[in-house]
């Protein structure tokens, strides 16, 4: 014969548990149905009668089938080193992620803390490792062959044009200068631009400035602590 | 690499003002400039920033006293109401320490001199 | 809101002594911080960035450290030249602020 279904409320089995999307009501003693995510228990259940659920008000929410009494708080306004990538609804909680050019340098449970600008390598050296959204940006020194004129938390270093004759040779941080004959880009390896990183989405590469005046001169750098920027650009 | 306010001047209560921080040797769509005061035999005090993309923030008790905009070689600071509260020497500073290939945005150098207001009836 | 509390607001030190100076925010603020030096009259002079990175051409004397909410400053073989007053800045601008500074300590040489 098949099991007889049992309707909330009801008295659980001996040492039985309820349900899934039911909970055990101590004072009814009796299993009652939970409310689902966007809204709360207005009214508890009883021994005759279920759980009365209603929608959560305004800037609330429950995310999860329950019987709470009230509603959550949403968090409040992102603020304005941050985005808001998932809106207060019914049903979950806002969250404020950093905006573009921005790491979060602390956390918290949903969204982020403190946001931190990603810092910015500057001319002669190229990103290494582009940021990420809970990661700042490391740079590293422009290899022989390759330049980079701008200050940049995107920008990787680039490869110099070969020049069929060179008018001025290039550094670390200036392209080659080419005669008027017709120059073209080596293919020097790792010469692809990397792609953006999660925290910089919304940024885009701005035409090359002119020159740079800073040194072209390598060194190595120091593995360490380092901070943010917001685009992509030229001195 | 420099920065130098202007404008500072005696004004009375009511009267709006701006100063106006130029800069020289670098960008201002690379670098971010902040606005600090410094109220006479007191501390220093964050007003705002105006970051590269042309995007402030403010001090939360600075929200609605102050505006700051830029050109392409300067960054103003406009006070909407001075009161005598707001007498001090202003000094802006860039967000932006260049060491070891990097630019450190949340440090502040290089600074101006500073420019003196004072606000009194 | 982030806030910077600094201790003591002035300290006197001997000529040769040491001079610690103690900087809390008041929530962690992961090594993001900065102290300026500022004598009468001048403009701050930027020290330490990153909690404990010295900048070009400070005199090794200054050394920073900390981590998480507590951060110090500290002056070895104190100076006449080193009489001035020290900020300590934390660096989040885009956040709810107060202030970016703690309060200054003025560092008296005998």
């Known amino acids: 014969l098949p099991a007889q279904v049992a309707f909330t409320p009801y008295a659980p089995e001996p040492g039985g548990t309820c349900r899934l999307r039911e909970y055990y009501d101590q004072t009814a003693q009796m299993c009652c149905s939970k409310c689902p995510p966007g809204q709360h228990a207005k009214v508890f259940c009883t021994k005759t009668s279920d759980t009365v659920c209603d929608s959560c008000e305004d800037s609330t929410y429950t995310q999860l089938w329950n019987w709470v009494p009230e509603c959550l708080s949403c968090g409040s306004r992102c603020s304005s080193d941050q985005v808001e990538t998932q809106a207060c609804t019914r049903e979950q909680n806002r969250i404020c992620t950093c905006r573009p050019g921005w790491y979060c340098a602390l956390s918290k449970q949903e969204g982020c803390r403190l946001c931190a600008q990603l810092r910015k390598c500057r001319p002669g050296f190229g990103v290494a490792r582009p940021g990420t959204e809970t990661s700042d940006v490391v740079c590293k020194p422009c290899a022989p062959g390759t330049f980079s004129n701008t200050t940049s938390s995107t920008d990787i270093c680039r490869p110099h044009q070969i020049c069929h004759v060179v008018a001025i040779p290039g550094n670390a941080s200036m392209d080659a200068v080419c005669t008027s004959t017709s120059p073209t880009r080596s293919m020097a390896p790792g010469a692809v631009h990397l792609p953006q990183p999660v925290s910089t989405r919304s940024q885009h590469t701005q035409p090359t400035p002119a020159p740079s005046t800073a040194p072209g001169t390598s060194f190595l750098l120091p593995v360490g602590p380092s901070p943010p920027a917001e685009g992509s650009t030229g001195d | 690499q420099s920065v130098e306010e202007s404008g500072g001047r005696l004004v009375t209560p009511g009267t709006p003002l701006t100063l106006t921080c130029t800069v020289s040797g670098f960008s201002l769509s690379t670098y971010d400039i902040n606005w600090v005061r410094q109220a006479p035999g007191k501390g220093l005090e964050w007003i705002g920033i105006?970051?590269?993309?042309?995007i402030t923030n403010f001090a939360n008790w600075a929200k609605g006293r102050f505006t700051i905009s830029k050109t392409s070689t300067t960054v103003d600071l406009k006070i909407a109401s001075p009161t005598t509260e707001d007498t001090a020497t202003y000094f802006c500073?860039?967000?932006?320490?260049?060491?070891?290939?990097?630019?450190?945005?949340?440090?502040?150098?290089?600074w101006g001199p500073g420019t003196l207001v004072t606000v009194s009836s | 809101a982030l806030v910077m509390t600094q201790t003591p607001a002035s300290v006197e030190a001997d000529v040769g002594g040491t001079v610690t100076i103690n900087c809390q925010a008041s929530e962690s603020i992961s090594n993001l911080l900065a102290w300026y030096q500022q004598k009468p009259g001048q403009r701050p002079k930027l020290l330490i960035y990153?909690?404990?990175i010295l900048t070009s051409g400070v005199s090794s004397r200054f050394k920073g450290s900390g981590s998480g909410t507590e951060y110090t400053l500290t002056i070895n073989g104190v100076q006449c030249a080193d009489a001035a007053t020290y900020y300590c800045q934390h660096g989040y601008t885009g956040t709810n602020v107060q202030n970016v500074f703690g309060g200054g300590t003025e560092v008296v040489v005998k």
């Open positions: 105006i970051y590269t993309g042309g």
């Open positions: 990153r909690a404990s």
């Open positions: 500073a860039r967000g932006g320490y260049d060491s070891d290939g990097y630019v450190y945005p949340d440090a502040f150098d290089p």
